[in-house]
């Protein structure tokens, strides 16, 4: 019977998760006489196969990061190998799984900030990339300051934009940072995928050295 997994030759789209070992057929095309066999062309990457009787399947796990869409064509042939139907487009959309971890572009970053700089004004960006689909949580990155060294009176002088990786001073940092007292700081920063919201997220860590410079501007005397 015709149904979800079998039917006549017509344009179709299938969605398959990457990384899954092939476990079932994709589709069984039915031949209409005089068609007796089927032929597959296009971006098969030696993964997609169609048997003469019209059984379309794949023989190994897909990788979205290699190819996110496979554009295939299926044609029906007669006994002489002449195309009698098609070719019709068959689109395989490869769905993303979280199989890549975010990676910082640098293992160590260096930056400087002037004391009394405006809170929230970025003076340095850390940047990570993730090969997974940014339109899914798998590729949505979440930046976080793990620790500030030194921690003085348990006050955070620096903050990070969780989405962009922009580092800036907190209100306390703007008011209290003083290069005469402590000219250098270090931040340990992590990035997590899954928007930072999952136990199953992948992560990476980087180190940021920050030099605090003196604010040479002096308020004019009255």
């Amino acid at each position: 019977q015709e149904g979800k997994f079998s039917g006549p030759l017509k344009p179709m789209t299938f969605s398959i998760y990457e990384g899954q070992e092939p476990s079932q057929i994709i589709f069984q095309f039915k031949a209409n006489p005089p068609a007796v066999t089927f032929e597959l062309t296009g971006e098969t990457d030696n993964i997609f196969v169609i048997e003469r009787e019209g059984l379309l399947y794949y023989n190994r796990a897909l990788d979205r990061e290699t190819r996110s869409t496979h554009n295939l064509q299926v044609a029906a042939l007669d006994a002489n190998g002449i195309i009698v139907e098609g070719p019709v487009p068959i689109t395989i959309k490869v769905k993303d799984i979280n199989d890549n971890r975010p990676t910082f572009l640098q293992s160590k970053y260096e930056g400087s900030v002037r004391q009394n700089s405006r809170p929230g004004k970025p003076f340095l960006y850390v940047n990570a990339t993730d090969l997974d689909d940014p339109a899914t949580p798998n590729g949505q990155l979440y930046y976080q300051i793990v620790i500030q060294l030194p921690m003085i009176n348990n006050v955070m002088y620096f903050q990070i934009n969780n989405k962009t990786g922009a580092i800036s001073l907190t209100r306390e940092g703007s008011q209290e940072l003083n290069p005469a007292k402590n000219p250098s700081y270090n931040l340990v920063i992590s990035v997590k995928d899954m928007g930072g919201q999952s136990e199953n997220s992948f992560s990476d860590t980087t180190s940021v050295d920050i030099i605090v410079t003196e604010n040479i501007w002096k308020a004019p005397k009255p």
Epitope: S107, Q144, I147, P150, M151, V188, S190, T205, S207
Partner: antibody, heavy 122, light 107 residues
Framework: EVQLQQSGPELVKPGASIKISCKAS????????LNWVKQSHGKNLEWIGL????????SYNQKFKGKATLTVDKSSSTAYMELLSLTSEDSAVYYC???????????????WGQGTSVTVSS | DIVMTQSPATLSVTPGDRVSLSCRAS??????LHWYQQKSHESPRLLIK???QSMSGIPSRFSGSGSGSDFILSINSVEPEDVGMYYC?????????FGGGTKLEIK
Amino acid sequence: EVQLQQSGPELVKPGASIKISCKASGYSFTGYALNWVKQSHGKNLEWIGLINPYNGGTSYNQKFKGKATLTVDKSSSTAYMELLSLTSEDSAVYYCARWDGNPHYYYAMDYWGQGTSVTVSS
Amino acid sequence: DIVMTQSPATLSVTPGDRVSLSCRASQSISDYLHWYQQKSHESPRLLIKSGSQSMSGIPSRFSGSGSGSDFILSINSVEPEDVGMYYCQNGHSFPLTFGGGTKLEIK
């Protein structure tokens, strides 16, 4: 005097999970990061990860993702490491170690616990 | 990951000898290199931080040098209580990594 007191030895069966503790004293617990280090066969040292008791922030060696989970209880100045789905490869001595809080001495571990021996055997 | 390689694996010395233990990083780590001593059945102990800064309470015979990717821990007159394992640690970038260790023994 700074001290890191770890929980006692563990003998567990494969597949089990355990939680080992590291109780800090003699300093401001929230002011310093705590690291966990694995020592196999009395030799190789491997950094598992760190936790900042101040905000609970963690950083893991990806080799130990899914194997170790780090937490803290600020009220008791205690750090914990849960080791999941243990196998014979996880048999080792596990140390907690405090970071020197000075940014000039990047990530040096200045105080260490006495270690917790974990043996995984059926 | 930064790979830390220590040599030699074992060093047999006579008390009073001056010895050098080598640690090499697979890439430049500036001076972010720390040395630890571990005696038998004890926890590691920080000896030298940031390449050459001695920890308080560490005997003056221990010194560290080097920058970039090559580092040396020197003991200028070995004493019997110095036997044990010596490890270097990358303090430059994550994941933090340790060398495989040098075993110091007395002949």
